[in-house]
Amino acid sequence: IPVIEPSVPELVVKPGATVTLRCVGNGSVEWDGPPSPHWTLYSDGSSSILSTNNATFQNTGTYRCTEPGDPLGGSAAIHLYVKDPARPWNVLAQEVVVFEDQDALLPCLLTDPVLEAGVSLVRVRGRPLMRHTNYSFSPWHGFTIHRAKFIQSQDYQCSALMGGRKVMSISIRLKVQKVIPGPPALTLVPAELVRIRGEAAQIVCSASSVDVNFDVFLQHNNTKLAIPQQSDFHNNRYQKVLTLNLDQVDFQHAGNYSCVASNVQGKHSTSMFFRVVESAYLNLSSEQNLIQEVTVGEGLNLKVMVEAYPGLQGFNWTYLGPFSDHQPEPKLANATTKDTYRHTFTLSLPRLKPSEAGRYSFLARNPGGWRALTFELTLRYPPEVSVIWTFINGSGTLLCAASGYPQPNVTWLQCSGHTDRCDEAQVLQVWDDPYPEVLSQEPFHKVTVQSLLTVETLEHNQTYECRAHNSVGSGSWAFIPISAGAHTHPPDEFLFTP
């Protein structure tokens, strides 16, 4: 901890005296205190000297010496009184600014400690303090008004009894500011506005704050609008409201409207956009592809975005076939409003069945007319495979039929022994059929393909397998020739149950 010389807590001198305050520490030291006049500062390594050769009442104050390099942040202080019979007070501030419920220190420093018994705080022109003003006095620091209130924003003077008469300090203005959490709260309604030319419109900008000192204005495309302001006070808040009424809107009224409010804490603004249109409109769109492919048994949500003015008079989802005349269940149709003019309509299709493939249409109506948006839903299936032995043009032929979606690819395998499924070790031969014959390919249905494998003589201790695969899965059928004809083996897990 630094050491101050002279080593006294208080020093009392007369005006005109020379004062030398020396501070010594282990490392470099620094003096701090009220930046009052006439002091000279001299630093030399681990000591610092604060001196004046002509002390005045203005040098009255507490001077603190610190050692910046000290991790413990130790400091030492000395209070200097410059005892001027004509000046009992050294006032360190013209104005004190605090927030409500803070302590307000009015820095009247007594220049003579002997006068402490006769001090008091008054308002200017000798007026008494307001009732319930709770204050204390310290000769080193001045008067403290505890938990200051906004209403105590006044001009004060410090009074000292000298020779039986009261001597006043110069005045100190106390400004107690209300604790304003931030800029005024704002609302601008509506958040978005659309009108057809000739219709009426209203835009309301309102701001509120705990303090009356704030401004609010409404601007259109950066031009401030001259609108009469309505003021109110409720729920301990001041409210200012600007209402723009337009009887017949035109295109020049369109654009960006900003509601702006400001106070000492800063500025808040919020904006909305006003669109003026020639006539009613209704637009349907989807972020999804209108052509959807989903694996059978899975679920799908179809979403349509609707932008409309005026509002919708009707809407529904319709199934257009081709499989049945069923219609989507209303409980599976969901509508959410994004904002006044934009809505999202969702149709949920859980655990899709084969009969639910096809076209789904969303229809909506407003004064602008009808609009529709149609989705095409195709179901994906893993291949189903079957093999038969037949003669075509007198030649023995294995005929493999595979159906699924997307269109399956076909591969033939010949392997040794009798087996339900050829494994790698058994395979004798593999044939890929790059272009199987398409037997049927209708929209929303499975694609059925046929592949032929001509076999001159069937080897009896061998298995012929037809394998089909697509992006969903694979299927196979094993054909085992036996002496009494032929025997076919679908795999155990062959049957697919959606």
């Epitope: 620094e30 003096w31 701090d32 205190g33 009220p34 930046p35 009052s36 006049p37 006439h38 002091w39 000279t40 500062l41 001299y42 604060l50 002509n54 001077y63 603190r64 360190l92 501030a93 013209q94 104005e95 004190v96 600014v97 605090v98 803070q102 307000a104 220190l105 820095p107």
Partner: antibody, heavy 117, light 110 residues
Framework: QVQLQESGPGLVKPSETLSLTCTVS????????WSWIRQPAGKGLEWIGR???????NYNPSLKSRVTMSVDTSKNQFSLKLSSMTAADTAVYYC???????????WGQGTMVTVSS | QSVLTQPPSASGTPGQRVTISCSGS????????VNWYQQLPGTAPKLLIY???QRPSGVPDRFSGSKSGTSASLAISGLQSEDEADYFC???????????FGGGTKLTVL
């Protein structure tokens, strides 16, 4: 080490009030005096006023009627409000620590304020 | 119009010694200490000399300050190109009860 950073609007309309904040980092705002100084382009420096962490203020007599300073020790910030702004108030505004015998030993980088409609 | 008076400009060649003056009155320089600030182009001022002749740590000893009566001066010896800047004097003014500055001196290193 202690650093100062001014913040506030770069543009103020005539007759409006300028609000600037100085944030003190790297040290405590407490037990020091803090000043605002301004400098019009190509001109000298002008002291606006100072505030102590207790809220005590002293202002330049030529600006006193328009100036309010406040301090928020919980945020390590002090602020300046200058009302009735005119083109003559266009300047770079600096905040600085004001110390006994050393005057302005640490300065902020400054913020340019233009008064224009 | 600044309270303290400084020459608007000064110049010197590298290695030279230059002096910048600052004159005031008994209300400021006469009864109070003087501080000097250096402002490099496009930057904030920096404390160069405090309490008439004290240098903060980090300031080269080529810079020195002095005060006599109601005038003060800043001397820069061994002038360097990086010394090209504006220099301001400042002091407390008793009757204004606040800080005052000089108008600044632009130092050019030729």
């Amino acid at each position: 080490q202690v650093q100062l950073q001014e913040s506030g609007p770069g543009l103020v309309k005539p007759s409006e009030t300028l609000s600037l904040t100085c944030t003190v980092s790297g040290g405590s705002i407490s037990s020091y005096y803090w000043s605002w100084i301004r400098q019009p382009a190509g001109k000298g420096l002008e002291w606006i006023g100072r505030i102590y962490t207790s809220g005590s203020t002293n202002y330049n007599p030529s600006l006193k009627s328009r100036v309010t300073m406040s301090v928020d020790t919980s945020k390590n910030q002090f602020s300046l409000k200058l009302s009735s702004m005119t083109a003559a108030d266009t300047a770079v505004y600096y905040c600085a620590r004001d110390r006994l015998g050393r005057a302005f030993d640490i300065w902020g980088q400054g913020t340019m304020v233009t008064v224009s409609s | 119009q600044s309270v303290l008076t400084q020459p608007p400009s000064a110049s010197g060649t590298p290695g030279q010694r230059v002096t910048i003056s600052c004159s005031g009155s008994s209300s400021n320089i006469g009864s109070n200490t003087v501080n000097w600030y250096q402002q490099l182009p496009g930057t904030a001022p920096k404390l160069l000399i405090y309490s008439n002749n004290q240098r903060p740590s980090g300031v080269p000893d080529r810079f020195s300050g002095s005060k006599s009566g109601t005038s003060a001066s800043l001397a820069i010896s061994g002038l360097q190109s990086e010394d090209e800047a504006d220099y301001f004097c400042a002091a407390w003014h008793d009757s204004l009860n606040g800080r005052v500055f000089g108008g600044g001196t632009k130092l050019t290193v030729l």
